[in-house]
Amino acid sequence: VQNSCDNCQPGTFCRKYNPVCKSCPPSTFSSIGGQPNCNICRVCAGYFRFKKFCSSTHNAECECIEGFHCLGPQCTRCEKDCRPGQELTKQGCKTCSLGTFNDQNGTGVCRPWTNCSLDGRSVLKTGTTEKDVVCGPPVVSFSPSTTISVTPEGGPGGHSLQVL
């Protein structure tokens, strides 16, 4: 004989000894019908705020408050936004690799320094993790360009940037 709990919809719970579909109580949810209990809704507080409120069929979703970003599956923790010279990765904020920079506060990825030689210009001021290179005026007599090898942190090397 088929258990009538099998016919219960999401947003309800059902006990085998009394197989009646009952609505989830407030602040609980069930995304699958026929379960013996509803799950307690996630509460977004402190560094978290609600991205999606809880319903009888879906858990609440949290995001981080201004100035913080999510880490972990389903935004399990909040970390302070990255500073200039850093970019966000799965592990959190990481310093830009050699040859890249990020001048933004809190957002953005590390991007490569400008290649001054593309415009036939020299490097007036070398780049940092926070600032792009400053290109000088066009070079009149072109000397052969040299290649420097950039080895990103954790990487095998072999990325090239052209500098004059």
Epitope: L88, T89, T107, V109, C110, R111, N115, L118, D132, P156
Partner: antibody
């Protein structure tokens, strides 16, 4: 909506060059990396390199240094890849793809339709 | 040199559940995000899972992603497999934030 439109198929002779284009629309071209990916028929995906169109800065995979050259024209929101000194080994599909600026290890959210380059004498 | 290893081919039956693996040879699978792409013959890849376990809009909730640090692997699970799931699946992560790495791809055959 975001789109990456690539140029048509290329048939080239060994030793020559081809220039592939990838025209972006529906977003700010200068604010996202464009990646280039190679796929030989029936094979896996291989990173060639990437360009930041905002300043023309580039990175190349070790294997593709001297083989590929990236440029970007911000006025037409188009990224280009020049493939030089072609050999039959360069016969493949070439895709351009965009990476979001959320994190340094993010996915490629939009891809071009791919270009088949065939190198044959 | 970071390598992501995927089984060359996997066969499964219609309406079953299949779990595709992507093993990192060195380093920690938790260091960088893992993403999954589906590619049908003659088409460009499309994202099925991004940032380990997130599903883009329009991707059925039959698809889910997970990370297992004990086996240093990422997994793409497909429930209630459909004929349209017959495709090649690639995993994608990073060696450094400059250097993306792809798995060799798994050809999923739906019987």
């Amino acid at each position: 909506q975001v789109q990456l439109q690539q140029s048509g198929a290329e048939l080239a002779k060994p030793g020559t060059s081809v220039k592939l284009s990838c025209k972006a629309s529906g977003y700010t071209f200068t604010s996202y990396y464009i990646y280039w990916v190679k796929q030989r028929p029936g094979q896996g995906l291989e990173w060639i390199g990437n360009i930041w169109p905002g300043n023309g800065g580039t990175f190349y995979g070790e294997k593709f240094m001297g083989k590929a050259t990236f440029t970007a024209d911000t006025s037409s929101s188009t990224a280009y890849m020049l493939l030089g000194s072609l050999t039959p080994e360069d016969s493949a599909y070439y895709f351009c793809a965009r990476r979001p600026d959320y994190s340094g290890d993010d996915y490629f959210d939009y891809w071009g339709q791919g270009v088949l380059v065939t190198v044959s004498s | 040199q970071v390598v992501l290893t995927q089984p060359k081919s996997v066969s499964t039956s219609l309406k079953s559940t299949v779990k595709l693996s992507c093993k990192l040879n060195s380093g920690n699978i938790g260091s960088y995000y893992v993403h999954w792409y589906q590619q049908h013959a003659g088409r460009s890849p499309t994202t099925m899972i991004y940032r380990d376990d997130k599903r883009p809009d329009g991707v059925p909730d039959r698809f889910s992603g997970s990370i297992d640090s004990s086996s240093n692997s990422a997994f793409l699970t497909i429930n209630n497999v459909q004929t349209e799931d017959d495709a090649i699946y690639f995993c994608h992560s990073y060696d450094s934030t400059i250097t993306p790495v792809f798995g060799g791809g798994t050809k999923l055959t739906v019987l």
